[in-house]
Amino acid sequence: AADSNPRGVSAYLSRPSPFDLFIRKSPTITCLVVDLAPSCGTVNLTWSRASGKPVNHSTRKEEKQRNGTLTVTSTLPVGTRDWIEGETYQCRVTHPHLPRALMRSTTKTSGPRAAPEVYAFATPEWPGSRDKRTLACLIQNFMPEDISVQWLHNEVQLPDARHSTTQPRKTKGSGFFVFSRLEVTRAEWEQKDEFICRAVHEAASPSQTVQRAVSVNPGK
Amino acid sequence: AADSNPRGVSAYLSRPSPFDLFIRKSPTITCLVVDLAPSCGTVNLTWSRASGKPVNHSTRKEEKQRNGTLTVTSTLPVGTRDWIEGETYQCRVTHPHLPRALMRSTTKTSGPRAAPEVYAFATPEWPGSRDKRTLACLIQNFMPEDISVQWLHNEVQLPDARHSTTQPRKTKGSGFFVFSRLEVTRAEWEQKDEFICRAVHEAASPSQTVQRAVSVNPGK
């Protein structure tokens, strides 16, 4: 099958993040090849489109891992309209030691759509942590699973490194859920005690975003 | 190195779950071997203890995966006292196609200890889902990362399949956090509107458990 693996080497092809697709409007897809043995010839990653139309210029990155293997990524900018209209993109991986080329393809997810529900909570004061609180955001029942999560404070988007968001998991029903966790300081909540958890998802209307505000001292 | 992998085959050795260790008091450890090519000779998994003392009888399971590879697990019951006192257990994996044996070892995690903080929240009613609510539990700032999460209703532990709990992730500080999500029905909360999220962790006192109650209709 086109998507089977020669043993020991894996290739993955991502879809654009909803944030890049709908907010930044500069979507990219990434072809990731892992577990390559280094110094065994060059890995070639070649992009194509099912429509036969030309592809943009891609960016390549090689990284040697701690376990001695090589990871190669190639990032391809795609057209917002092309992606939304269902274009399929292929990444072909060749290497002297691979018995055959690895082929990966990606396209917009098919199937039913459902907008996310967003809920945000603040933890109460905990002994010994008076000047720190944790905010939690539960985003659930969305389909498909592609979602971007952001936190905002006073209309400023906080850096992604500030929060930790889980990978989408299946609910008992047909949708998906994620949790996001943000630690905030007293200085932040006393500046302005309103933090916003925002989900970017294709089924959300209007403008592909749903958000919920949360305060450390609610009702105050 | 003892823990390096022949390419394409991986072995993992788990620690006992805190629930098995402290509540059931029948801890087990599992040696998991993945990505084996089937019908290429027998895989042997052999257990030993660093102290040289004998090991209990282990249980073996083989499973063919969708991608055509074979997964082999061996589960070994260990003594609660032996584990707590720091015994090291080894799993040795041999196979005709492996250039050398795979060795994995496990022992009680060293380093600082911190008890979990447990916070539980209920989602408000969402249009179109009047007879269902989601409960969320944030468990954080614990060390080491080994934790078991349970939900209880009417003093009865709900089956693990009822909830979805994330893998431990690092906080900004030195500890770890997990989220757990439980869907409950109107029939359940109208029977008794109190659900308990319980964390089992070695640093929790007393009796290695910390819990928090949550209601769908608080203060009603």
Partner: antibody, heavy 122, light 107 residues
């Protein structure tokens, strides 16, 4: 209507102590952080410090110019804010305002009292 | 501590005119800036907070703008009650500090 009424300002000698009070009405005092701000004659405003609400353990913050000499406290049962001023200096002479901090923007202030005058002179 | 520099220190204007007062901060305070008006012999009165949010009951002739380190307060169609001293104050962190003031006088 939010009302803040300061009292206790008077003429004192350097080195003496003085306690100012601020009676409040028209809002739920217990919910709010409360500040003191002063203004020497013909000069700019200077923030002295604030006290947090009960939910935030009544903790206090002070400007470096008064830290260790001035102490803010509150009596939630009477809706009164206090400023205890010790070891007063001539440069402490000013109009002292009791000020309510905003909700949500806790470092911002909204309502001010009419002020009470303190003179420090020998 | 964050320093606030107001300019001009004083200005004269006539009723009906539009004036702008600026406040520069010594470090980035995002939008955490408030403006107060103080009439002669009276207490200060909050006009604007979070750079641009008008306080309750304040005339829409007042408008605040800016972020980072540069802020301004604009007063349109000056009225007799607008004359006095205007102060900016950051509400970004502790200690809270005020500008030295801008005295707006009737020409």
């Amino acid at each position: 209507e939010v009302k803040l009424v300061e009292s206790g300002g008077e003429l004192v000698q350097p080195g003496e102590s003085l306690r100012l009070s601020c009676s409040t009405s028209g809002f739920t005092f217990t919910d709010y952080y409360m500040s003191w701000v002063r203004q020497p004659p013909g000069k700019a405003l200077e923030w002295l410090g604030f006290i947090r609400n009960k939910a935030n353990s009544y903790t206090t913050e002070y400007s470096t110019s008064v830290k260790g000499r001035f102490y803010i406290s509150r009596d939630d049962s009477q809706n009164i804010l206090y400023l205890q001023m010790n070891t007063l200096r001539p440069e402490d002479g000013a109009t002292y305002y009791c000020v309510r901090n905003k909700k949500v923007y806790y470092y911002a202030v909204d309502y001010w009292g009419q002020g009470t005058s303190v003179t420090v002179s020998s | 501590d964050i320093q606030l520099t107001q300019s001009p220190a004083s200005l004269s204007a006539s009723v009906g005119e539009t004036v702008t007062i600026t406040c520069r901060t010594s470090e980035n305070i995002y939008s955490y800036l408030a403006w107060f008006q103080q009439r002669q012999g009276k207490s200060p009165h909050l006009l604007v907070y979070d750079s641009k949010i008008l306080a309750e009951g304040v005339s829409s002739r007042f408008s605040g703008s800016g972020s980072g380190t540069q802020f301004s307060l604009e007063i349109n169609s000056l009225q007799p009650e607008d004359f006095g001293t205007y102060y900016c104050q950051h509400h970004y962190g502790i200690p809270l500090t005020f500008g030295a003031g801008t005295k707006l006088e009737l020409k």
